[in-house]
């Protein structure tokens, strides 16, 4: 079966919907096709375009009950079940390499229906807060995707650096100094699509002292003692997508 040739025979696009979908790494994701009954279909095709890889195609032809794959090497990306029973695609589990564009093409006798997903894999950064010099604190959000945002309460004299890693994650480092001596406690607030986290630390007056915030260095999902952290679940933690029709 040459699914490309057949798709071209029915190249009229009757409807196309594209959605951006942020999804947490290590969760399971299910991507859905348009709501069209199998009885109306000739071919179902999933096109998967991942960065730096040839386009992968998974196709099912109803007439022959035949499935075919082209350039598909990732065994974590599969049909949810037999395509004649469920045309959805699943990624179990989502890895950082699954960033890309996924499109379901449903070929009917009258034209095609497309449902596309721009999948953005989210990686929760590891957050640490410590004091490295007199009245200077360093807050780091390590290996997050996308880059986390760091803010301080109260505001200080701050410098922020970003370090980009080859796997697409970013480490954000914010170093702040407070000249005002009545500031004794500072809070680092890390905002990220996977959730938000706040750490605070008491500034030591002793020169050269190094002090870590309690619980610093743990992941965003951890619960910390003494309520030094506030955890707010972000919008990116859902396994399934709410569809827009």
């Amino acid at each position: 079966m040459d699914e490309k040739q057949i798709t071209q025979n029915y190249s009229k696009v009757l409807a196309e919907v594209n959605t951006s979908w942020p999804v947490k790494m290590a969760t399971n994701a299910v991507l859905c096709c348009p709501p069209i009954a199998l009885r109306n279909l000739i071919i179902i095709t999933w096109e998967i375009i991942l960065r730096g890889q040839p386009s992968c195609t998974k196709a099912y032809r109803k007439e022959t009950n035949e499935t075919k794959e082209t350039n598909c090497t990732d065994e974590r990306i599969t049909w949810v079940s037999r395509p004649d029973q469920n045309s959805d695609l699943q990624i179990r589990p989502v890895a950082i390499t699954h960033d890309g564009y996924y499109r379901c093409i449903m070929v009917t006798p009258d034209g095609n229906f497309h449902r596309g997903y721009h999948l953005q894999v989210l990686v929760t950064p590891e957050v640490t807060l410590f004091q490295n010099r007199n009245r200077t604190a360093v807050c780091k959000a390590v290996a997050g995707k996308p880059a986390a945002q760091i803010s301080w309460i109260p505001e200080g004299d701050c410098a922020t650096k970003q370090e980009y890693w080859s796997n697409g994650t970013v480490t954000v480092k914010s170093t702040c100094h407070w000249e005002v001596h009545n500031v004794s406690t500072v809070t680092c607030h890390v905002s990220h699509l996977t959730g938000n986290k706040s750490l605070y630390i008491e500034l030591l007056p002793v020169p050269g002292a190094k002090k870590s915030a309690k619980g610093g260095g743990s992941g965003l999902n951890d619960i910390f003692e003494a309520q030094k952290i506030e955890w707010h679940e972000g919008s990116g933690g859902h396994h399934h997508h709410h569809h827009h029709h």
Partner: antibody
Framework: EVQLVQSGAEVKKPGASVKVSCKAS????????MFWVRQAPGQRLEWIGY????????KYNEKFKGRATLTSDKSASTAYMELSSLRSEDTAVYYC????????????WGQGTLVTVSS | DIQLTQSPSSLSASVGDRVTITCRAS??????????MHWYQQKPGKPPKLLIY???NLESGVPSRFSGSGSGTDFTLTISSLQPEDFATYYC????????FGGGTKVEIK
């Protein structure tokens, strides 16, 4: 404009057969599945079956299997529903309805054909 | 087979009233991110007319006073302000694999 025009009313005796036609226009007949639905007086709508003129696939409600036969004439863009061994409880209005792809919904219906079964 | 139970079976209302009709399925009609529930209006001697598809989508040309909601097994059709032409019978319908209709709700003039 999509139109589904059904044949006229029929009066039949118990045990007889009836064949209702549904002529489609305004679209490519073979591209869409045609459903048949009936409505007895004061009753809910009831699915009889469907035919896909693209490949002649048919599916029937278990209740009508063996009594209902769905066919189509592609050259005439017409779907047919034949019901045999008629009984009085088959007295109903019979509708054809085109299934639209997205959501499997029925936007276009025939006007209905009243079939009366009476001795 | 999925059974659809509509309530109430009939109701009396006045022009301008807000009307709510419910439909309960014997098992979930939601799959793959979509709810396969549609709503139709039928007047005597006429075929049904599609109002709402996939639970909440307004069919083209249908007045915005009609709305649908729900997922899983429980669905609702709402008419925000009943108009004289809205007195009719309303049916919910599921059509994923097998086609099923609810028993209907007749909306009458009070």
């Amino acid at each position: 404009e999509v139109q589904l025009v059904q044949s006229g009313a029929e009066v039949k005796k118990p045990g007889a057969s009836v064949k209702v036609s549904c002529k489609a226009s305004g679209y490519t007949f073979t591209s869409y599945v045609m459903f048949w639905v009936r409505q007895a007086p004061g009753q809910r709508l009831e699915w009889i079956g469907y035919i896909n003129p693209y490949n002649d696939d048919t599916k029937y409600n278990e209740k009508f299997k063996g009594r209902a036969t769905l066919t189509s004439d592609k050259s005439a863009s017409t779907a047919y529903m034949e019901l045999s061994s008629l009984r009085s409880e088959d007295t109903a209005v019979y509708y054809c309805a085109r299934e639209d792809y997205y959501g499997s919904r029925f936007v276009y219906w025939g006007q209905g054909t009243l079939v009366t079964v009476s001795s | 087979d999925i059974q659809l139970t509509q309530s109430p079976s009939s109701l009396s209302a006045s022009v301008g009233d807000r009307v709510t009709i419910t439909c309960r399925a014997s098992k979930s009609v939601s799959t793959s991110g979509y709810s396969y529930m549609h709503w139709y209006q039928q007047k005597p001697g006429k075929p049904p007319k599609l109002l709402i598809y996939l639970a909440s989508n307004l069919e083209s040309g249908v007045p915005s006073r009609f709305s649908g909601s729900g997922s899983g097994t429980d669905f609702t059709l709402t008419i925000s302000s009943l108009q004289p032409e809205d007195f009719a019978t309303y049916y919910c319908q599921h059509n994923r694999e097998l086609l099923t209709f609810g028993g209907g709700t007749k909306v009458e003039i009070k």
